[in-house]
């Protein structure tokens, strides 16, 4: 969380951003809030990116003002217009690209003053893993698959029964480049699986951490998966 204070003739206003990550090819949100004003006409929101000449987005007098917008963001940005009046300046970024990563500034002017805060935006790919029993294998085998990751993650297996055990000798992980030549499909196989145990396949890079759990008993199979972004720091 980054909190910025502005300096003005009246008083500075507090602007708060939250560092976040974008999943390439999908839509992302750059989060920014500010002390609300009571009238829309006096609110100006400017999003800027370090190293980019034009603006990322500008909203003023109740409308998008995109004449100064940089080419790389053309047609890809929007504010939540109905939420501006309650202090939400967050930016929706469509079709996130790897090159969207960097330092952004959320700059706010209201009738009460000015303020700004920076935001670190990381980009990559992350997806939920699915763990299944591989019935084609000769021994009891689990297969963990996640369709899109970038940068290349690490994969670690764990088990509830053998806590702290190292499964690197009995697992095999491969990374297959997807058709767009950036993201990769992650496949990890765990051998010599015992019944009545819960296994976890943990995939992690510097952007996200995802876990796929599977519990195999003689009567049923239970699955659960979870994904967590690693860098949600407020500013």
């Amino acid at each position: 969380l980054i909190i910025g204070f502005g300096i003005s003739g009246r008083h500075s206003i507090t602007v708060t951003t939250v560092a976040s990550a974008g999943n390439i090819g999908e839509d992302g949100i750059l989060s920014c809030t500010f002390e609300p004003d009571i009238k829309l006409s006096d609110i100006v929101i400017q999003w800027l990116k370090e190293g980019v000449l034009g603006l990322v987005h500008e909203f003023k007098e109740g409308k998008d003002e995109l004449s100064e917008q940089d080419e790389m963001f053309r047609g890809r940005t929007a504010v939540f217009a109905d939420q501006v009046i309650v202090g939400n300046a967050s930016l929706r970024l469509k079709n996130v690209q790897l090159t969207d990563a960097g330092t952004y500034k959320c700059y706010i002017i209201t009738s009460k003053g000015k303020g700004n805060a920076n935001l670190e935006y990381k980009t990559g790919a992350f997806s939920m893993p699915e763990v299944n029993v591989d019935y084609n294998a000769s021994s009891e085998t689990l297969r963990c698959e996640a369709p899109r990751w970038f940068p290349q993650p690490t994969v670690v297996w764990a088990s509830q029964v053998d806590q702290g055990a190292n499964f690197s000798e009995v697992s095999n992980t491969s990374f297959e480049l997807n058709s767009e030549n950036v993201t990769m499909k992650v496949v990890s196989v765990l051998y010599n699986v015992t019944i009545n145990n819960t296994y976890s396949c943990m995939i992690e890079n510097d952007i996200a951490k995802a876990t796929g759990d599977i519990k195999v008993t003689e009567s049923e199979i239970k699955r659960r998966s979870h994904l967590q972004l690693l860098n949600s720091k407020a500013s």
Epitope: I38, L40, S41, E61, G62, A81, I85, K112
Partner: antibody, heavy 117, light 107 residues
Framework: QVQLVQSGAEVKKPGASVKVSCKAS????????MHWVKQAPGQGLEWIAA????????DYNQKFKGKAKITAVTSTSTAYMELSSLRSEDTAVYYC??????????WGQGTMVTVSS | EIVLTQSPATLSLSPGERATLSCKAS??????VAWYQQKPGQAPRLLIS???YRYTGVPDRFSGSGSGTDFTLTISSLEPEDFAVYYC?????????FGGGTKVEIK
């Protein structure tokens, strides 16, 4: 859940003052504007003023400057509006209303102020 | 001061009919218009914010449209509980102002 509870009805003589309270609960009182709105009998709605309890910033409708004074006490999450030099045309229901997720999304039940000699 | 003019002042309709309420601003207010419903003895209730966003819990027979100076609240099929007074309000500039109201009454 968000609630705004206003003080009870008041009957005042011309020239007197009255202070209406609005106790807020269910949200962060200091983070949102609190407004006051007047509705005279059989009439429409009229915005009086607003206060941002986080820093006591106020905005007044010019028409009510000198008539209304608004304050907020953050320790009790209560907003106040004092009306001075009361006249018969100040007879009205006064509402407090806040803007949490949308404009005027929560309202108090209203306080009837009657000015009569 | 931005003046909001609502029309008609009174709308006499039967349950099941469509109601179209108009609100015209004296200057451009972008999308900064909200609509409220008020019944006798009650506080106003938010229906539509920012011209077209239906507030939580408001039935989908209520819809708002418009931007700039012309705004419309539409009730697609009137229910008995919809007979009330409706106000538009702008938050584009101060002083914040309300329209004079439209009373929707049973024909």
């Amino acid at each position: 859940q968000v609630q705004l509870v206003q003080s009870g009805a008041e009957v005042k003589k011309p020239g007197a003052s009255v202070k209406v309270s609005c106790k807020a609960s269910g949200y962060t009182f200091t983070s949102y504007w609190m407004h006051w709105v007047k509705q005279a009998p059989g009439q429409g709605l009229e915005w009086i003023a607003a206060i941002y309890p986080g820093n006591s910033d106020t905005d007044y409708n010019q028409k009510f400057k000198g008539k209304a004074k608004i304050t907020a006490v953050t320790s009790t999450s209560t907003a106040y509006m004092e009306l001075s030099s009361l006249r018969s045309e100040d007879t009205a229901v006064y509402y407090c209303t806040t803007t949490v997720a949308h404009y005027f999304d929560y309202w108090g039940q209203g306080t009837m102020v009657t000015v009569s000699s | 001061e931005i003046v909001l003019t609502q029309s008609p002042a009174t709308l006499s309709l039967s349950p099941g009919e469509r109601a179209t309420l108009s609100c015209k601003a004296s200057q451009d207010v972008s999308f900064a218009v909200a609509w409220y419903q008020q019944k006798p003895g009650q506080a106003p209730r938010l229906l539509i914010s920012s011209a077209s966003y239906r507030y939580t819990g408001v039935p989908d027979r209520f819809s708002g449209s418009g931007s700039g100076t012309d705004f419309t609240l539409t009730i697609s099929s009137l229910e008995p509980e919809d007979f009330a007074v409706y106000y538009c309000q702008q938050h584009y500039n101060t002083p914040l102002t309300f329209g004079g109201g439209t009373k929707v009454e049973i024909k």
